[in-house]
């Protein structure tokens, strides 16, 4: 048979060009991509492949080495001059490792036809690949017909003599998917039919999405489908100390590339992104939600000495309302309002003030009016009551200012303007008010209701009485009114500064209707009801005192 | 007031286990970081351990770790140092402080101290 | 383990004098903008003393003569006006990583 060197001789050593070939292409093999796991590379294979060549007399494995003395299995055949040729050169079995779509890349040389004398009939410039699946590793069967034909190889280049002289190798590379596959692995055929080829190197491998950590999720190792355009939609996991809203996805093609990245995960509460991972806040720094970048210090007035803080704890005398976010200073009570003024008009007071000094870094300051009544005398003071109405509000006020209506008239009050804010309730320190006294005006008395008859003749009625509830200032002098019953229109008008008067020259048993009523100066009060007392006959005894119902 | 009062200390046979305690009072002390301090005689200050207040933060000096363990219990409002395997080097004043509020923190309050003496 | 290189090992001042002590650590005790650089005094048979957090912040109550500055690696501790009783052993301990060390101290005398 002719060799490829272009002698007819069969040599039993690798002829020059295979040499010079191998030595060349080897130094430009390079490393699988990282999308790719090789299921075989005839390069990396140290000791026999352990293939089998039929018949005998075909293909056959040149020893070579490279310049690492590392084995090359080189397998060629030229049998370009024979007729009929079907030479069959088989590998060993190899498992897919559970991959659908397997890839096959061969790197080879073929010589030219036209470069031979005399073969131009019988030589070829192309061979066969087939497979054959098995889940058997000891099941590799040379049936021609079971194998299923991947395709037919055609180089690209080809060589010529000349190529040989100027030691130039042309080395073709092609590759070929094969799926889908269904059993555990697979057999490789190479049917040569009369080329003159030199087998450099087989390589089988599956494509993969490698492993990756994307928005803190991580992807495993992915083998890619058995279809060339699906996209395996893949669930990652988040890493440690990472949460999700939306299960992280994402699709991983057929080329062995992750696409469509879906949701994504998020550092938890206390933990920030760093460098792919979640890192812990350290003492200082908080984080009170996932949805937040990274861990910040703590606001104002708080402190955390933990790792993984979620929030701050407020220093001593501040607080936080519960509805106050984890990102604000803590705060404390406002200091009292300053400068608190007053105003009395009768009954009336109006109170005016400036905010406190230090709004305890709050902007929801208000202000609560306490009214105190105080008794001059004694000095006690007790609450005002109910009586009393505040414009436009006792508790709550947004304004600096307030006013009193239906105060008690020349009563003494004191009035507390306290500031507060949000965090008050929480405080148990005390309240923090300004406090301003103030006397109202003397106004008209209330009427006299408790009225006493005294001593009782036929001409003459003595009385007495209380002063009013509400005497509203000091009570200058009482009038007194009385007429005979039945003649309104006809009365007399005593003034005493007393609580006792005496009515005289009145008729005997007579019934006289007498009101009185008190003056301070602010006017007189209106006139009390009316009370009936008769005189008494002419020959009949005075009358004992007693109180008038 | 914040106060922090250590006892504990005295005179341990080298290899031997001691327990230190710190009690504190006039502040929060669950919400506050505690610190073990040492400090050789006519030597300088050691930093030896670190407990946070809810116990979920723990550091050691190298020279201690595997042989002390630093606990707390704040329903008592008490810190303590378990000593084990005792050596003479260990011999120190122990000091408790506080960790403070304004950051970056420094130890802004310190007990008086106990004396701890390994010696056969 | 981050080190602390105190200096001077010792100093004499006079009274009203400057006395400046300096503290470099092996590596950066820098984070987030912030120095995690403590300065303490300790007088004999009592307990150290917070006299600046933060590289230069002044602890409450401490004298406002006290003062400290620097970042990164190089820090130092200024006593300006010195008055009688500074007399003591200065710490310098940086608190931005465990373990939380301390220098060996600068001991001052008042001349």
């Known amino acids: 048979p002719a060799s490829l060197a272009g002698c007819y001789s069969a040599p039993r050593r690798a002829p020059l060009w295979t040499c010079l070939l191998l030595c060349a292409a080897l130094r430009t093999l390079l490393a699988s991509p990282s999308n790719e796991v090789n299921l075989l590379d005839s390069r990396t294979v140290m000791g026999d492949l352990g293939w089998i060549a039929f018949p005998k007399n075909g293909w056959e494995e040149i020893g070579e080495v490279d310049e690492n003395y590392a084995p090359i299995h080189t397998y060629q055949v030229c049998k370009v001059m024979e007729q009929n040729q079907n030479n069959w050169l088989l590998t060993s079995w190899i498992s897919n490792e559970g991959a659908s779509r397997i890839f096959i890349e061969l790197k080879f040389t073929l010589r030219d036809c036209n470069s031979l004398p005399g073969g131009l009939g019988t030589c070829k410039e192309t061979f066969n690949m087939y497979y054959f699946e098995s889940d058997d590793q000891n099941g590799r069967n040379i049936k021609e017909n079971q194998y299923i034909k991947i395709d037919t190889i055609a180089a690209d280049e080809s060589f010529t003599e000349l190529d040989l002289g100027d030691r130039v190798m042309k080395l073709n590379t092609e590759v070929r998917d094969v799926g889908p596959l269904s059993k555990k692995g697979f057999y490789l055929a190479f049917q040569d039919v009369g080329a003159c080829i030199a087998l450099v190197s087989v390589r089988v491998y599956y494509k993969k999405c490698p492993s990756v950590v994307r928005h803190l999720a991580v992807f495993p190792d992915t083998i890619t489908g058995a279809d060339s355009s699906q996209l395996l939609e893949v669930s990652g996991s988040c890493v440690n100390h990472s949460v999700t809203d939306e299960p992280p996805k994402m699709h991983c093609s057929a080329e062995g590339e992750w696409l469509v990245p879906i949701g994504k995960c998020m550092c938890k509460a206390g933990y920030e992104e760093k460098n792919g991972t979640c890192q812990v806040c350290r003492p200082g720094f908080f984080k009170a939600s996932p949805h937040i970048q990274s861990c910040g210090k703590c606001p104002p007035h708080s402190y955390t000495h933990e790792e993984a803080s979620t929030s701050c704890v407020c220093e001593k005398d501040y607080f936080r309302r519960e509805s106050d976010p984890p990102t604000m200073a803590c705060t404390r009570p406002p200091s009292a309002p300053r400068n608190a003024i007053s105003n009395v008009n009768e009954t009336s007071v109006f109170l005016e003030w400036i905010p406190p000094a230090d709004t305890g870094g709050r902007k929801d300051v208000s202000y609560y009016i306490a009214c105190k009544k105080c008794n001059s005398h004694a000095g006690v003071c007790e609450e005002c009551g109910g009586h009393v109405r505040y414009l436009p509000r006792q508790s709550g006020l947004k304004n600096t200012s307030v006013m009193m209506v239906d105060l008690l008239a020349h009563t003494n009050y004191t009035f507390e303007i306290e500031a507060v804010n949000g965090v008050s309730d929480l405080s148990p320190g005390a309240r923090q008010y300004v406090s301003v006294n103030v006397t109202t005006n003397q106004a008209a008395p209330s009427p006299v209701t408790n009225v006493k008859k005294g001593k009782i003749a036929k001409n003459s009625i003595s009385l007495s009485w209380q002063e009013p509830d509400r005497p509203n200032g000091i009570i200058l002098e009482y009038e007194i009114k009385y007429f005979e019953k039945d003649q309104e229109t006809s009365y007399t008008i005593i003034k005493s500064k007393e609580t006792t008067i005496t009515a005289e020259g009145l008729k005997p048993a007579s019934v006289y209707v007498f009101q009185i009523r008190a003056r301070t100066a602010a006017g007189y009060g209106v006139f009390s009801r009316r009370f009936e007392f008769e005189t008494t006959p002419v020959f009949a005894a005075s009358s004992d005192q007693s109180q008038i119902p | 007031e914040v106060t922090l009062v250590e006892s504990g200390g005295g005179l341990v046979q080298p290899g031997g286990s001691r327990k230190l305690s710190c009690a504190a009072s006039?502040?929060?002390?669950?919400?506050?970081?505690i610190h073990w301090v040492r400090q050789a005689p006519g030597k300088g200050l050691e930093w030896v351990a670190y407990?946070?207040?809810?116990?979920?933060?723990?550091y050691y000096a190298d020279t201690v770790k595997g042989r002390f363990t630093i606990s707390r219990d704040n329903s008592k409002n008490t810190l303590y140092l378990q000593m084990n395997s005792l050596r003479s080097e260990d011999t120190a004043m122990y000091y408790c402080?506080?960790?403070?509020?304004?950051?970056?923190?420094?130890?802004?309050?310190w007990g008086q101290g106990t004396s701890v003496t390994v010696s056969s | 383990d981050i080190v602390m290189t105190q200096s001077p090992g010792s100093l004499a001042v006079s009274l009203g004098q400057r006395a400046t002590i300096s503290c470099k650590a092996s590596?950066?005790?820098?984070?987030?903008?912030?120095?995690?650089m403590n300065w303490y005094q300790q007088k004999p048979g009592q307990p150290p003393k917070l006299l600046i957090y933060g590289a230069s912040n002044l602890e409450s109550g401490i004298p406002a003569r006290f003062s400290g500055s620097g970042s990164g690696t190089d820090f130092t501790l200024n006593i300006h006006p010195v008055e009688e009783e500074d007399a003591a052993s200065y710490y310098c301990q940086q608190s931005n990583e465990d373990p939380f060390t301390f220098g060996s101290g600068t001991k001052l005398e008042i001349k």
């Open positions: 402080a506080r960790y403070g509020t304004s950051f970056p923190y420094g130890l802004d309050y």
């Open positions: 407990i946070s207040g809810a116990s979920t933060t723990i």
């Open positions: 006039g502040f929060t002390f669950s919400t506050f970081g």
């Open positions: 590596q950066s005790v820098d984070y987030d903008g912030d120095s995690y």
